[in-house]
């Protein structure tokens, strides 16, 4: 069976939107009006992995682009990147672990924990126009809470 996917945008708990920053990075900033068109639309695929009521494994691809968020070690540190894939083979139900995030719902907010690196989360900073990254702390000054907005296909 084909993998189930939905299109969505994400905003952090400060209401910052996510946009492209160079070819292989995302950044977070406040957008208004026409600028909202800059925000990236994700194709969120529901993939194989450890699942529970509030924890669902997903892959986050960029809609109509052969780019997926992935988690890899760089200089011995878990790092978030946008990785190019062969569009003929992705998305798929059994995604490699580096592409998998545990979507965790808590109090109507979403967290995205790396399946490859437990307790590391997709994070943004309080500051404007700074990169989205993989952070190893929750509840500190880095932001790990997001809301999801559905986008029609």
């Amino acid at each position: 069976a084909p993998v189930r996917s939905l299109n969505c945008t994400l905003r952090d708990s400060q209401q910052k939107s996510l946009v492209m920053s160079g070819p292989y990075e995302l950044k977070a900033l406040h957008l208004q009006g026409q600028d909202m068109e800059q925000q990236v639309v994700f194709s969120m695929s529901f993939v194989q992995g450890e699942e529970s009521n509030d924890k669902i494994p997903v892959a986050l691809g960029l809609k109509e682009k052969n780019l997926y968020l992935s988690c890899v070690l760089k200089d011995d540190k878990p790092t978030l990147q946008l990785e190019s894939v062969d569009p003929k083979n992705y998305p798929k139900k059994k995604m490699e672990k580096r592409f998998v995030f545990n979507k965790i719902e808590i109090n109507n907010k979403l967290e995205f924990e790396s399946a490859q690196f437990p307790n590391w989360y997709i994070s943004t900073s309080q500051a404007e126009n700074m990169p989205v990254f993989l952070g190893g702390t929750k509840g500190g000054q880095d932001i790990t809470d997001f809301t999801m907005q559905f986008v029609s296909s």
């Epitope: 920053s21 160079g22 990075e25 309080q126 500051a127 990169p131 990254f133 952070g135 190893g136 000054q141």
Partner: antibody, heavy 118, light 107 residues
Framework: EVQLLESGGGLVQPGGSLRLSCAAS????????MFWVRQAPGKGLEWVSV????????RYADSVKGRFTISRDNSKNTLYLQMNSLRAEDTAVYYC???????????WGQGTLVTVSS | DIQMTQSPSSVSASVGDRLTIICRAS??????LAWYQQTPGNAPKLLIH???SLQSGVPSRFSGSGSGTDFTLTINSLQPEDFATYYC?????????FGGGTKVEIK
Amino acid sequence: EVQLLESGGGLVQPGGSLRLSCAASGFTFSKYFMFWVRQAPGKGLEWVSVISPSGGMTRYADSVKGRFTISRDNSKNTLYLQMNSLRAEDTAVYYCARVGYGGNSDYWGQGTLVTVSS
Amino acid sequence: DIQMTQSPSSVSASVGDRLTIICRASQSINRWLAWYQQTPGNAPKLLIHSATSLQSGVPSRFSGSGSGTDFTLTINSLQPEDFATYYCQQADSFPLTFGGGTKVEIK
């Protein structure tokens, strides 16, 4: 008054190491991104590295990637740049700078000179 | 990486002149552009951020304009203390990059 004071520069041989420090005062250091920017003698400005307030996010210029490491100690209000495998082309005045809105450098230190020569 | 090109690289002008410096980005950087002034032996000083916003304490004779790829710094009525080197810097994406600088000399 915002103040940034770099130290640790000096003469080092190619292949050697140096650790720069930047002591910050006059603002809440733990809330700000910080940069290192360098300027070779008689040349323009080159961005070197950035670190987020928590230290969780760092980025480097390609020219220093794998050789330099940026870090910070928020309890000491201090920014660091560990520089390894130094090359002649790393000779420059190194400035630390506070990051302002959207990624500009709104306050700068006076700089510390690093000379890599045999 | 985004390349930033400044022109002219140097210019001679007189006190009271109106001066325009141009900065071009190799791709759109929206409005994420800053301008700095540097005098010999000193650290750079932020003049303009977000392409058009005057940094606190900077005289109003300095102004910035532009968006996308083309930006200008204008100094209305040059003062003796304005003879310096000016740099633009893009903050749209890492690695951050600076223009090569424009040296403003006394004619």
